[in-house]
């Protein structure tokens, strides 16, 4: 898979790690550090944004410590001397668990997201454009370090108030009738950002397509719900969407909607209270006739993980669950390219979305 942005990612780098940030830090640059906290040795790890490889000049030292109940130290080192520590007495990381750590460089500060949630702001103490190196050390194993350049035009999520000049931002802020879910949105107006990963293919197993738009992947341990994003280019024959997640143990229902403007072209609605998978279309706020037939038993189970494939074809959508075809849904809204928004809500935790 190819990561978007101007700099190639560092894949599975050995720790301790030091690597160049090509072009240095820029306003709007987003750097994602994805890895797992080691469960055994050590009680600390650190991510440093520094000048050169010596470690004497560190613009931002981000240092989770599994000590004294757990806390995170942020600091700056100039000419070998540390400044005053800023401590956050909340530990968003867990030993032995994977994490997705995003650093967004902005004119006044670094914004740090852990697993998609704004964790801390660290105001610049030295000019950030001096930074040309990222280093990681301590009790951590890395999967990748990726770079999202602000000049890269990403997919713009539906209902986002963030202008296109910003990096891709998730979750989008809902407008209008959609209610703000508790505990997800940061108090300040800064966007929560998330890395967008482009893969080479535009559909499963597809090397050529028209239009040739690569799928967007949003790799994250957990997503805010409801999750809303645009489908770049809308639907077209051979376009596929892959979602995975876990059904909550007490789940009643969840839904996956493919939308066109105010219409819901495809409403996929597993209902645990009815032991059914309901499919329908809503046009101008009016629901059509439901489709419920299944070739086998209800594939979704409370408390269990699942994956859903939606494959668009000329006449229908094919839907597979856990890699096995489940049903077809013949298009009721036939202007496929206008079906360009994905909405997911209800009693699940999303773990992977690829559009």
């Amino acid at each position: 898979m190819a990561f978007s942005g101007s700099q190639a990612p560092y894949l599975s780098p050995a720790v301790p790690f030091s690597g160049t940030i090509q072009g240095g830090l820029q306003d709007g640059l987003q750097i994602t550090v994805n890895g797992t906290v080691l469960s055994s040795s050590g009680t600390r790890f650190a991510v440093n944004f520094q000048t050169g490889f010596s470690g004497n000049d560190i613009a931002f030292h981000f240092n989770p410590r599994f000590e004294d109940g757990g806390y995170v130290v942020c600091n700056t080192r100039q000419n070998g001397s540390w400044g005053p520590e800023e401590r956050k007495t909340h530990m968003p990381f867990q030993k032995g668990m994977p994490f997705d750590l995003c650093f967004l460089v902005q004119s006044s500060d670094f914004k740090v997201m852990v697993n998609g949630i704004l964790f801390v702001q660290y105001f610049h103490r030295v000019p950030f454009h001096r930074v040309d190196t990222i280093s990681v050390n301590g009790s951590v194993q890395l999967s990748y370090i990726s770079f999202q350049n602000p000049r890269t035009v990403p997919v713009q999520p539906a209902f986002s108030t963030v202008p296109f000049s910003q990096p891709v931002c998730f979750p989008p802020r809902p407008r209008g009738r959609r209610q703000k879910p508790p505990g997800v949105w940061p108090a300040n107006p800064a966007p929560i950002t998330q890395t967008v990963i482009h893969t080479v293919q535009s559909a499963p197993g597809q090397m050529f397509s028209t239009p040739a738009i690569p799928p967007m992947m949003y790799p994250h341990p957990a997503y805010p719900m409801p999750f809303i994003t645009t489908i770049l280019g809308g639907l077209y024959p051979s376009k596929s969407i892959l979602l995975s997640g876990t059904v909550l143990p007490s789940a009643q229902r969840f839904h996956i909607n493919l939308c066109s403007g105010n219409h819901i072209a495809f409403h996929l609605n597993p209902r645990f209270d009815e032991n059914a998978v309901v499919r329908n279309t809503q046009i101008d706020n009016s629901w059509g006739s439901e489709e419920r037939s299944l070739p086998r038993k209800m594939p979704f189970v409370r408390g269990q993980s699942f994956s859903v494939w939606i494959l668009c074809e000329a006449h229908c959508l094919k839907v597979a669950v856990d890699g096995q075809h489940l049903f077809e849904y013949y298009h009721r809204l036939r202007n496929l390219p206008t079906i360009n928004r994905l909405e997911v809500g209800g009693d699940i935790q999303l773990t992977h979305v690829q559009t």
């Epitope: 898979m1 197993g205 494939w309 890699g323 075809h325 992977h352």
Partner: antibody, heavy 117, light 107 residues
Framework: EVQLVESGGGLVQPGGSLRLSCAAS????????IHWVRQAPGKGLEWVAA????????TYADSVKGRFTISADTSKNTAYLQMNSLRAEDTAVYYC??????????WGQGTLVTVSS | DIQMTQSPSSLSASVGDRVTITCRAS??????VAWYQQKPGKAPKLLIY???SLYSGVPSRFSGSRSGTDFTLTISSLQPEDFATYYC?????????FGQGTKVEIK
């Protein structure tokens, strides 16, 4: 680029064991079924086994049930076929293939297993 | 288990010919049938999925159809690169059986 690379084939005596590996890259391994399909010399394709790495769900052809075990390591993006109590009729080129929900869309180059004394 | 009976086992044809290969499922498999092409010494390639859907990048001269439990692969105008062996596979339920294969040879 999607790639599947098989390894581990070779010559083994009847009753012996062999473990085949299928290293996958270029796609989200855990959300695709991985299938093993074999082809005896000059014969047709025979489906052997499959696994869905995300849930560890497995399924086997009757001819290998109880003798072969399919497994996957999602941290390594690799599927395995452990073959025990091998027989002469297990001699074949073994392919691993990616199971897109509607077909086997990518295949490895195959690895030859020869069971002979 | 579902048996897939493929016919003919081999056929000879010329460039430009229309070629039809059939697979009959021993029981209902809905439309969960795929067709593959294999050339000597090479791995198979997916041509058709869901009985009649053309896989991406496959030339449009290949098509598939279904009538009950009978599935047909048609090559509308045979090209030199189409001489190969073709297999059907049912993907309705495990074990995911293949047909015996049809070898398309040059007349």
């Amino acid at each position: 680029e999607v790639q599947l690379v098989e390894s581990g084939g070779g010559l083994v005596q009847p009753g012996g064991s062999l473990r085949l590996s299928c290293a996958a890259s270029g796609f989200t391994f855990r959300y695709y079924w991985i299938h093993w399909v074999r082809q005896a010399p000059g014969k047709g394709l025979e489906w052997v086994a499959a696994i869905f790495p995300s849930g560890g769900i497995t399924t086997y052809a009757d001819s290998v049930k109880g003798r072969f075990t399919i497994s996957a390591d999602t941290s390594k993006n690799t599927a395995y076929l452990q073959m025990n109590s091998l027989r002469a009729e297990d001699t074949a080129v073994y392919y691993c293939a990616r199971g897109w929900p509607w077909g086997l869309d990518y295949w490895g180059q195959g690895t030859l297993v020869t069971v002979s004394s | 288990d579902i048996q897939m009976t493929q016919s003919p086992s081999s056929l000879s044809a010329s460039v430009g010919d229309r070629v039809t290969i059939t697979c009959r499922a021993s029981q209902s498999v809905s439309s969960a049938v795929a067709w593959y092409q294999q050339k000597p010494g090479k791995a198979p390639k997916l041509l058709i999925y869901s009985a009649s859907s053309l896989y991406s990048g496959v030339p449009s001269r290949f098509s598939g159809s279904r009538s009950g439990t009978d599935f047909t692969l048609t090559i509308s105008s045979l090209q030199p690169e189409d001489f190969a062996t073709y297999y059907c596979q049912q993907r309705d339920r495990s074990p995911y059986t293949f047909g015996q294969g049809t070898k398309v040879e040059i007349k």
